[in-house]
Amino acid sequence: DSSKWVFEHPETLYAWEGACVWIPCTYRALDGDLESFILFHNPEYNKNTSKFDGTRLYESTKDGKVPSEQKRVQFLGDKNKNCTLSIHPVHLNDSGQLGLRMESKTEKWMERIHLNVSERPFPPHIQLPPEIQESQEVTLTCLLNFSCYGYPIQLQWLLEGVPMRQAAVTSTSLTIKSVFTRSELKFSPQWSHHGKIVTCQLQDADGKFLSNDTVQLNVKHTPKLEIKVTPSDAIVREGDSVTMTCEVSSSNPEYTTVSWLKDGTSLKKQNTFTLNLREVTKDQSGKYCCQVSNDVGPGRSEEVFLQVQYAPEPSTVQILHSPAVEGSQVEFLCMSLANPLPTNYTWYHNGKEMQGRTEEKVHIPKILPWHAGTYSCVAENILGTGQRGPGAELDVQYPPKKVTTVIQNPMPIREGDTVTLSCNYNSSNPSVTRYEWKPHGAWEEPSLGVLKIQNVGWDNTTIACAACNSWCSWASPVALNVQYAPRDVRVRKIKPLSEIHSGNSVSLQCDFSSSHPKEVQFFWEKNGRLLGKESQLNFDSISPEDAGSYSCWVNNSIGQTASKAWTLEVLYAPRRLRVSMSPGDQVMEGKSATLTCESDANPPVSHYTWFDWNNQSLPYHSQKLRLEPVKVQHSGAYWCQGTNSVGKGRSPLSTLTVYYSPETIGRR
């Protein structure tokens, strides 16, 4: 109700002789600040005096002075909300009730706190989870209802008297709600922890033992089993007997069922701790274990590998890999069920024993076609020799062998003929499925492996074929040796190296690029006239008359080929110059007279010079000299000179006669 002071603190505090107590405390006074505080031990109210009697452990006066003997007890509070107390050291006779007598200006209050001080350090308390199961992490808690700033303590965990390796987390609480020290240890118990003693030991700051609590761990776990076998090595021969015994070394809770497993599968009607196998067969070889279950789950023993020994069974051959490519490596593996494993092997190739091959594997580093065939083997161990199985077939694959290109035509082949070729081979695995030809052309393949070349060219020199299965094998190229008339016949001037000038020595060569057969004849002609039959046509001193269109012919047994016409050009200085007059050599004055300088020249005249009868050059340089109007004084002999790049030529004199016109005669 509203007439009460409000206090908060632990109801009871625990300690032991020589330790200390720290009492966390808060309060709220009804009015104003605290003026007086007395700490009583076992206070009793005296009705007569209306005061409390009892041992005064602590007293604060209004002036704040504290008697020196009160050092053991300390008021750590304040005047309005904190009432924390400390007693250090605490004694056995401090047990009982502490009374906090609080007075403000107008109000008074007595607050009681229980103090329990034991003679010796009291033990902590171990708290365990309700169930502990193997391999499941649990937290073990050690709780001590004590904590005091002036008296450090520690809690240590021990397993079977040995400090536990796992790290514990220690926490303390010194609050108005609770005072304790707690240590929490997380660990994953194993089945072997079952029944083991765990101790939480209370120690002082120096590690000196103060007290402890102990528990024996109850760890629920699946049955832990041991399997025993007779004979101990678990190796028997067919027909022998075997006994296996399952021992439960630990189970918590008790086991409920027993079963036996072979290769992970439960054996029917085997539900006792002993498994008797009489007259075993090789099929009973395998991994055996016993399984015992309890409420936690099934426990399994380690596996015992029972080996029932027997002679090798008929063998099979495994080939890595078939089909095999010629040149590759191949491994043969002889597979035969046997116990113990075979120690010796005999290998057969097409029924014939392979000498020196006694291992489980046969390795051929470089396979050849003759290695193909049936491989079989026989395995042998200490109990006997197995039978030879059906064997395995090795297929050796290789490209077509000895491929040749064959010409089917009669020889020789002439340009323009139709040529037929075939592609032949000796052997192939797998079979040939296609052919290739080189060079490529727009040729027919009328059937597989046959090539037809229509209108064979002069330049079809060689043809090669390939026969192909998974790989292509090329034949050496075959020469067609096509015969043809001479080709690319042309006239070539050998000398002179520059232009041909009249009088030069001239040689013309009849060239051709090729001819098959090589034996040829030459013919020279000019304007349809045969000039010679040599490869060269020679002129000791060429004359302009030799100029013209020349052709040469080359022929062999296949045919003849003509060159293009070749023009022979002879360069010479102007010659045969003459002056022609128009309209004639007699012209009436006043008319027009044209003198033309005619010449024969190669190259044509590039420059004309005119001369009169006095050999005086006239200021005219063209081929024609036009006199208009012509005068009588123009009468006389004229000559001209022509010049080209080769030289000069001059004409004889030609006389021009200019006569008077009738008018002139009439005037005279």
């Epitope: 309700p130 040995v162 528990v215 041991e226």
Partner: antibody
Framework: QVQLVQSGAEVKKPGASVKVSCKAS????????LHWVRQAPGQRLEWMGY????????EYNQNFKDRVTLTADKSASTAYMELSSLRSEDTAVYYC?????????WGQGTTLTVSS | DIVLTQSPDSLAVSAGERVTMNCKSS????????????LAWYQQKPGQPPKLLIY???TRESGVPDRFSGSGSGTDFTLTISSVQAEDVAIYYC????????FGGGTKLEIK
């Protein structure tokens, strides 16, 4: 010091039941398991089972599982072993025992005679 | 359960002689957490409860004469009395406490 004090000798008829007590002192009763071991005349020691007084958890030897019952009274720090359907071969000395980390404590033994 | 086999069943020796008796376990009794063998040896005289001689296979219980010693690890253990005295006549039991409890069949020691 640790003491385990057992109840006195018993004579029972076949088919009857017997309950033997074991009073513990000198240690915290709930801290350790209490085991029961018997010894028939001239025979080896034979473990029968244990009880964890902390939570009354029990574990039994399969040979006794159907006939033995272990109980504990925490307030009296006393453990009990009850054996039912008695037969003559149950004639033996019955011991309660407990282990500490480095020692074992045994009761003085209780002689049971089963006779018609 | 773990089976303990003791040998010999009985032996008679003269006082002052050295004597050894064996205990073989069907499984290891070594506890990996503290590397201790959870095997004890007891001496039992007629009409008395077993008296602990050795724990952890080789640690002598306080008050036990030092002529008694234990050895072995895993599955094979030995109790040795270096110089047999008349008061040593008794049956000696081995006891494993790693998993549940089991006892050996005992070895009876007599004085010639």
């Amino acid at each position: 010091q640790v003491q385990l004090v057992q109840s006195g000798a018993e004579v029972k008829k076949p088919g009857a039941s017997v309950k033997v007590s074991c009073k513990a002192s000198g240690y915290t009763f709930t801290s350790y398991w209490l085991h029961w071991v018997r010894q028939a005349p001239g025979q080896r020691l034979e473990w029968m089972g244990y009880i964890n007084p902390r939570n009354d958890y029990t574990e039994y030897n399969q040979n006794f599982k159907d006939r033995v019952t272990l109980t504990a009274d925490k307030s009296a720090s006393t453990a009990y072993m009850e054996l039912s359907s008695l037969r003559s071969e149950d004639t033996a000395v019955y011991y309660c025992a407990r282990r500490d980390i480095t020692t074992f404590y045994w009761g003085q033994g209780t002689t049971l005679t089963v006779s018609s | 359960d773990i089976v303990l086999t003791q040998s010999p069943d009985s032996l008679a020796v003269s006082a002052g002689e050295r004597v050894t008796m064996n205990c073989k376990s069907s499984q290891s009794v070594l506890y990996s957490a503290n590397h201790k063998n959870y095997l004890a040896w007891y001496q039992q005289k007629p009409g008395q409860p077993p008296k602990l001689l050795i724990y952890w296979a080789s640690t002598r219980e306080s008050g036990v004469p030092d002529r008694f010693s234990g050895s072995g690890s895993g599955t094979d253990f030995t109790l040795t009395i270096s110089s047999v005295q008349a008061e040593d006549v008794a049956i000696y039991y081995c006891h494993q406490y790693l998993s549940s409890w089991t006892f050996g069949g005992g070895t009876k020691l007599e004085i010639k």
